[in-house]
Interface confidence: medium
């Protein structure tokens, strides 16, 4: 699947962590699942959710760990760069993403206080941006040893392997199918209404359509609501407002990779939702 | 003081190139980005790109990317810009301008007027 | 590209008169910027971070707005504020600048 292709670092810096946080903390992403996590308190980079139990070489998580110490480095190095002004967040957004041809196109970006104001130029070999912010942190990062060099190895070599190693030894997780459980309830709402919520839990990939219909006609789609769970899968409702007494000629229809075909579902009976 | 220092007016025929200066001093020229900016007769001001003279990383304005070339001489505080295969359009005010300390162009050259006539 | 798009093109107003001219951008940008140009010289920093005055500029100028919406006023028009107000933004790439608004003197 297209959107499996790519291995994205989400990395995050604060300049004035609260008291026992962390001042640096990054997700790593295989496609939409997030397969690796590490903060500065910690210190190590370790797997989440379903990668736990992927047969990676055993020095894997050591280079991980390295290579985003280094970051850790350089990303507070930053604030030093700035000066004592702030407080400052720092985000960077690095990885790389497998084209149709299997070659690899690179990304690094970064944001200050959730503005874009620099970026990683790998055929110029140094980061790049004319905010004054940007010179200061880029010749902080410059000065750092072979810091530009490692950048590009770990943009132009590191990512695009490791993506490659992940696609061979993680398949299983990358097409890991889990299909929704299901409930549609009916709440009273507003005098002479009621809500409707069409709820889907535990499901993967995250792509999910939930729809209504009316006798068999289409109502539309609701108001949604959608998110992850701690294990990596997703959940997500929607609701819609219909007249009470109505609600029986409702049912919801959810459409998902891991279901065969689009699956209704019926308003549950006020005893089984109590 | 500050002050950004451009090179006079040129006159140039079509299809020519045409290479202007923008010597900077009363600052560390290292320490700011230097932009430039064009400026056709009787219209408004257009970005081209910028140069970061301490590592010559360059930025164009994609519109700009094959007919500007920006960069820059440490040593001398100087900081050029090249126009090639000029055309009639080419005919403008060229302001180099230094980005300050708030994300601004706080200082700009006097300009470098360019004609391009056959 | 961030297509900053200035209103009115053209404004004449007398002396002591209240000015506001408007910056529209076809994105949100987070800061606005403002810039003077008089006839025959380089443009002049006027506001930073859409209303930060900048050195030396007369308390007179002002500068506000969010988003996609921006503006500059003079609140009392003087001889020597007859110029061409351009607005840009640093928000993203390429740079751009507005068309301008000249402002003339009745």
């Known amino acids: 699947a297209e959107s499996h292709l790519s291995l994205l670092y989400h990395l995050t810096a604060v300049s004035s962590p609260a008291p026992g946080t962390p001042a640096f903390w990054v997700s790593g992403w295989l496609g939409p699942q997030q397969y690796l996590s590490y903060n500065s308190l910690r210190g190590e980079a370790e797997p989440c959710g379903a990668w736990v139990w992927e047969n990676q070489v055993s020095w894997y998580w050591e280079k991980e760990t390295t290579d985003l110490r280094i970051k850790e480095k350089l990303f507070l190095e930053a604030f030093k760069a700035l000066g004592g002004k702030g407080p400052y967040t720092l985000q960077g957004l690095l990885g790389c993403e497998l084209g149709p041809d299997n070659t690899s196109v690179p990304t690094a970006k970064f944001a200050l206080n959730g503005e874009e104001f620099m970026n990683f130029d790998l055929k110029q070999g140094t980061w790049g941006g004319d905010w004054p912010e940007a010179l200061a942190i880029s010749q902080r990062w410059q000065q750092q040893d072979k810091a530009a060099n490692k950048e590009l190895t770990f943009l132009l070599f590191s990512c695009p392997h490791r993506l490659r190693e992940h696609l061979e030894r993680g398949r299983g997780n990358l097409e890991w199918k889990e299909p929704p459980s299901m409930r549609l309830k009916a709440r009273p709402s507003s005098p002479g209404f009621s809500v409707l919520t069409c709820s889907a839990f535990s499901f993967y990939p995250p792509e999910l359509q939930l729809r209504f219909l009316r006798n068999g006609l289409a109502a539309g789609t609701g108001q949604g609501d959608f998110g992850p769970n701690s294990d990596g899968s997703f959940h997500a409702s929607s609701s819609l407002t219909v007249k009470s007494g109505d609600e029986h000629h409702y049912c919801c229809i959810v459409q998902h990779a891991g279901l065969a075909q689009p699956l209704r579902v019926e308003l549950e009976s006020p005893a089984k939702s109590s | 003081q500050i002050q950004l220092l451009q090179s006079g007016a040129e006159l140039a025929r079509p299809g020519a190139s045409v290479k202007m200066s923008c010597k900077a001093s009363?600052?560390?020229?290292?320490?700011?980005?230097m932009h430039w900016v064009k400026q056709r007769p009787g219209q408004g001001l257009e970005w081209i790109g910028y140069i970061n003279p301490s590592s010559g990383y360059t930025n164009y304005n994609q519109k700009f990317k094959d007919k500007a070339t920006l960069t820059a001489d440490k040593s001398s505080s100087t900081a050029y810009m090249q126009l090639s295969s000029l055309t009639s359009e080419g005919s403008a005010v060229y302001y180099c301008?230094?980005?300050?300390?708030?994300?601004?162009?706080?200082?700009w050259g006097q300009g470098t007027s360019v004609t391009v006539s056959s | 590209e961030n297509v900053l798009t200035q209103s009115p093109a053209i404004l004449s107003a007398s002396p002591g008169e209240k000015v506001t001219m408007t910056c529209s951008a076809s994105s949100s940008v987070s800061y606005m910027y403002w810039y003077q140009q008089k006839p025959g010289s380089s443009p002049r920093l006027l506001i930073y971070?859409?209303?930060n005055l900048a050195s030396g500029v007369p308390v007179r100028f002002s500068g506000s707005g969010s988003g996609t919406s921006y503006s500059l006023t003079i609140s009392r028009m003087e001889a020597e504020d007859a110029a061409t107000y351009y607005c840009?933004?640093?928000?993203?790439?390429?740079?751009?600048f507005g068309g301008g608004t000249k402002l003339e003197i009745k």
């Open positions: 009363g600052y560390t020229f290292t320490s700011y980005t």
């Open positions: 971070d859409t209303s």
């Open positions: 840009q933004q640093w928000s993203s790439y390429p740079r751009t």
């Open positions: 301008a230094r980005s300050g300390l708030r994300r601004v162009l706080d200082y």
